[in-house]
């Protein structure tokens, strides 16, 4: 093939080479970026800054590489519309940092810096520690900060992340009430801090104030939605970043719904209670204090994380005559009780028969899948047992 | 298939307390079953101890239950078994087994009273 | 009473049939479990609940119940089939587990 006398020349299938000395200044209008898997830079004197807007368009590279060029900052942004990059070569350019943001949300398997005159300071707090746990293969590159010595020595005592405290009401907090809450940001070089509201939705009306170091959030008219939602409190420095989360328990009183017993491989009075402190719970029979045991108990189904309303069972593992009645259940909280009923029949006494009569107990040969915890089991074919009626 | 494996002493002294835990594997002590304690004192008939449910919930042999005490450690899933002031009429085989049913049991082990 | 009262012993001969019977005023309201013990070795679940039987215990065992009785039932008896049976229930109050006393079954 004839030598190509492009800055850039294709290579293999969905890659492109720009060697030609000095012919590149920025990325803009790389041709055949929307498919392009590997860029390779080399040479390029010119090209000093990478930016968010230099990458767009290539969504399919996995490959960069830039060596030997004048590369001297590249953007904390700059790889936003490459989430596919694996690999990045970044080796001798005239790098003095690189921002922990930079890498953030790539999955990056190989990350070479060496050969460039890094300056040794807290913003590389992150790639000293990518070096100590072995990640992107930096290790290897027993990376240098110019005039200083070893990456791994630089002291990183003082290198922390922003520390954050939330400080939320102590009293109770009701159902349309106003809350306050304040974020409290500590550290060296901080840059950004903010909140993160997008569980709140309808849970309440959202106020911002003030800014570093001391961020206020008021929630106006608050509902008992708000429970379990997440009030994130975020600040960023140039190690990295911070979040704390809060909820703001809203006091409401207990509710509660009965459903029909349905029969599955137990059977299952079904529940939903709700309130805020979490409600105690009882259960009658025929008014009187019904004793949980292995035979019959309340199941919680696993809760919902972001809801306090708790689904369950009242399960009776192969009840008799003797359980049908009346269930009542009873929840109470701090700011109020309910209570819901309901009858349940499950069977007419199959331990009285006729004499005369013969008792059916025929068995099937297979075997019946067990997902429940009971014993795979097989069953009759026939009920156990026809009921009479006893005069 | 779950499995539940007893241990703890072979040998208690009379006024002791007996104390045994039952480790169950294959399945997790929080599912949807009780777990009981059952024994057998030698030559003789089974006798049952008490039950247990991971949220706490407990019952126990009315002949028994000023002596003990059952609980559960989610953690480690596994449950226990206390039983106070012994006597030489506690020497029995010991076991664990899943409740209500009693479809799985341990192996068991002899616990001995005696000084 | 919360208990429940077994024969202590029966036989059988090899490949007949035989009822081994488990009485008792609870029996009325719950149904009976039933346990192989075989010596040396643990208890094993063979009948339970409204007459089920868990996978893995042959189709000869099998469970009735009337009035305050309740019955395991051996048709066609094999020799492994000799062990100690135990019937279980809860008692009146539904609060609490009982056993019978068991019964020696020998296969001639």
């Known amino acids: 093939a004839a030598p190509c006398p492009d800055a850039c020349c294709p290579h293999g299938s969905s890659g492109l080479r720009c060697t030609r000395d000095g012919a590149l200044d920025s990325l803009h209008h790389l041709p055949g970026a929307e498919n392009l898997t590997e860029l390779y830079i080399e040479n390029q004197q010119h090209l000093q800054h990478l930016e968010l807007r230099d990458l767009r368009g290539l969504g399919e590279l996995r490959n960069l590489t830039i060596v030997k060029s004048g590369l001297r900052f590249v953007a904390p942004d700059a790889f936003h519309f490459t989430p596919r990059l694996s690999r990045l070569n970044l080796s001798f350019n005239a790098l003095e940092s690189l921002s922990w943001k930079t890498v953030q949300g790539l999955s990056l398997q190989e990350l070479v810096l060496s050969g460039n005159p890094l300056h040794c300071s807290c913003a590389l707090r992150w790639l000293q520690r990518w070096e100590e746990e072995g990640l992107g293969g930096v290790p290897e590159q027993k990376l240098q900060c110019h005039g200083q010595g070893p990456l791994a020595h630089m002291p990183n005592a003082s290198c922390g992340v922003p520390t954050l405290k939330v400080q939320v009401p102590n009293a109770s907090v009701d159902v349309g009430d106003d809350v306050l809450l304040r974020c409290q940001v500590e550290g060296r070089g901080l840059e950004q801090a903010g909140w993160i509201l997008t569980e709140l939705e309808q849970s309440a009306t959202v106020m911002k104030s003030g800014g570093l170091p001391s961020l206020g959030l008021t929630l106006a008219n608050v509902t008992s939605d708000l429970n379990r939602k997440n009030v994130t409190c975020w600040a960023e420095n140039d190690v990295g970043r911070a979040e704390v989360s809060v909820q703001v328990n809203v006091s409401f009183p207990a509710s509660v719904q009965l459903h029909t017993a349905v029969e599955m491989h137990h059977w299952c009075i079904p529940f939903s209670v709700d309130g805020q402190p979490a409600p105690s719970l009882r259960w009658l029979f025929n008014g009187s204090v019904l004793n949980e045991t292995s035979f019959i108990f309340t199941e919680f189904l696993e809760p919902a994380a972001n809801e306090t309303v708790r689904h369950g069972c009242l399960r009776l593992n192969q009840p008799t005559h003797v359980n049908n009645g009346n269930y009542t259940l009873l929840a109470a909280n701090p700011f109020g009780q309910a209570s819901a009923s309901i009858m349940a029949a499950f069977m007419d006494n199959p331990f009285e028969f006729n004499p005369e009569d013969p008792i059916p107990v025929s068995f099937s040969p297979v075997d019946t899948n067990s997902t429940s915890g009971d014993p795979v089991e097989k069953k009759d074919e026939t009920p156990f047992g026809v009921s009479v009626a006893v005069g | 298939e779950v499995q539940l494996q007893e241990s703890g002493p072979g040998l208690v002294k009379p006024s002791g307390t007996l104390s045994l835990t039952c480790a169950v594997s294959?399945?997790?002590?929080?599912?949807?079953?009780?777990w009981t304690w059952v024994r057998q004192p030698p030559g003789k008939g089974l006798e049952w101890i008490g039950e247990i449910y991971h949220r706490g919930n407990r019952n126990y042999n009315p002949s028994l239950k000023s002596r003990v005490t059952i609980s559960v450690d989610k953690s480690k899933n596994q449950f226990s078994l206390k039983l106070s002031s012994v006597t030489a009429a506690d020497t029995a085989v010991y076991y664990c087994a899943r409740a209500p049913w009693f479809d799985y049991w341990g192996q068991g082990t002899l616990v001995t009273v005696s000084s | 009473s919360s208990e429940l009262t077994q024969d202590p012993a029966v036989s059988v001969a090899l490949g007949q049939t035989v009822r081994i019977t488990c009485q008792g005023a609870s029996l009325r309201s719950y149904y009976a479990s039933w346990y192989q013990q075989k010596p040396g070795q643990a208890p094993v679940l063979v009948i339970y609940g409204k007459g089920n039987r868990p996978s893995g215990i042959p189709d000869r065992f099998s469970g009735s119940s009337s009035g305050n009785t309740a019955s395991l039932t051996i048709t066609g008896a094999q020799a492994e089939d000799e062990a100690d049976y135990y019937c279980?229930?809860?008692?009146?109050?539904?609060?609490?587990?009982?056993f019978g006393g068991g019964t020696k079954l020998t296969v001639l």
């Open positions: 279980n229930s809860q008692d009146s109050s539904g609060n609490h587990l009982i």
């Open positions: 294959g399945g997790s002590i929080s599912s949807s079953n009780w």
